[in-house]
Amino acid sequence: LWMHKVPASLMVSLGEDAHFQCPHNSSNNANVTWWRVLHGNYTWPPEFLGPGEDPNGTLIIQNVNKSHGGIYVCRVQEGNESYQQSCGTYLRVRQPPPRPFLDMGEGTKNR
């Protein structure tokens, strides 16, 4: 059992969904779990999140906000063998740029 490389980081806009892949060479009976190292608290034990969503073990986080930030790590286990762990993907949550004060619709400008 071995893991493919995962992206070092993933940038998602506030309110969008984040999709994390856990590529591995295992057969379908592999058990994929996801863990998070909390942003700014890297000495804390990783936090257990739950299983992957599909046979590939994808993690989907809906409607992300700033508190979702952190490093997401997947672990893959076949049978009762020791698990393999990804290096982790850092989730960055991007604030959408504020609308400029003068960003008016055309109808407003012409009044």
């Epitope: 779990t33 999140l49 739950g50 299983p51 969503e53 020791s82």
Partner: antibody
């Protein structure tokens, strides 16, 4: 502070239905797989059902398979358990819980009584 | 999905140490070591005492310790106190989003 607040319990006749809700606050709800655990009067804890973070994966104990349906509304930070064809042996306190690791959270439970 | 096996009851005098065992199969425990121990007082929700086999959450007394060897997990309580009297449950991750609990152990402080 993390809070899980269950509601929807009550008295129902055998064969009837109930829908339990669990409103979550103080945690990144959409990140977590969530679970329902029950405890019959004077008995031990029994895992009932679980659901992945986005709702794509659902899991059931054999004792409730085909009768109970777990779901979640991530826009409302709420977990649900639809219970159909209820039996006397389903009488229990039902807890909503995020299980596993240090971020382990439980509600205070809601009592479901199935009796004629 | 059969329950993990725990002794129905254990007892000890104040100041003594007791150990509660929790036995399952290799598929119950896997290699994740996602074994938790809960304390439950009557009418209350379970309280996490040990996670991942041997780690203690903040706020839990260091009199509580956990270990795991093969297909058996153990909870040890040293320096027993009256407030330790409660029911104790082990719980293990069993893959997917499925979990299995032990049948529970009633601890009596004599």
């Amino acid at each position: 502070e993390v809070q899980l607040l269950e509601s929807g319990g009550g008295l129902v006749q055998p064969g009837g239905s109930l829908r339990l809700s669990c409103a979550a606050s103080g945690l990144t709800f959409t990140s977590y797989a969530m679970n329902w655990v029950r405890q019959a009067p004077g008995k031990g804890l029994e895992w009932v059902s679980g659901i992945s973070g986005s709702g794509g994966g659902t899991y059931y104990a054999d004792s409730v398979k085909g009768r109970f349906t777990i779901s979640r509304d991530n826009s409302k930070n709420t977990l649900y358990l639809q219970m159909n064809s209820l039996r006397a042996e389903d009488t229990a306190v039902y807890y909503c819980a995020k299980l596993g690791g240090w971020s382990d959270y439980w509600g205070q439970g809601t009592l479901v009584t199935v009796s004629s | 999905q059969s329950a993990l096996t725990q002794p129905a009851s254990v007892s000890g005098s104040p100041g003594q140490s007791i150990t509660i065992s929790c036995t399952g199969t290799s598929s119950d425990f896997g290699s994740y070591n996602l074994v938790s121990w809960y304390q439950q007082h009557p009418g209350k929700a379970p309280k996490l005492m040990i996670y991942e086999g041997s780690k203690r959450p903040s706020g839990v007394s260091n009199r509580f310790s956990g270990s795991k060897s093969g297909n058996t997990a153990s909870l040890t309580i040293s320096g027993l106190q009256a407030e330790d009297e409660a029911d104790y449950y082990c719980c293990s991750y069993a893959g997917g989003s499925t979990w299995v609990f032990g049948g529970g152990t009633k601890l009596t402080v004599l």
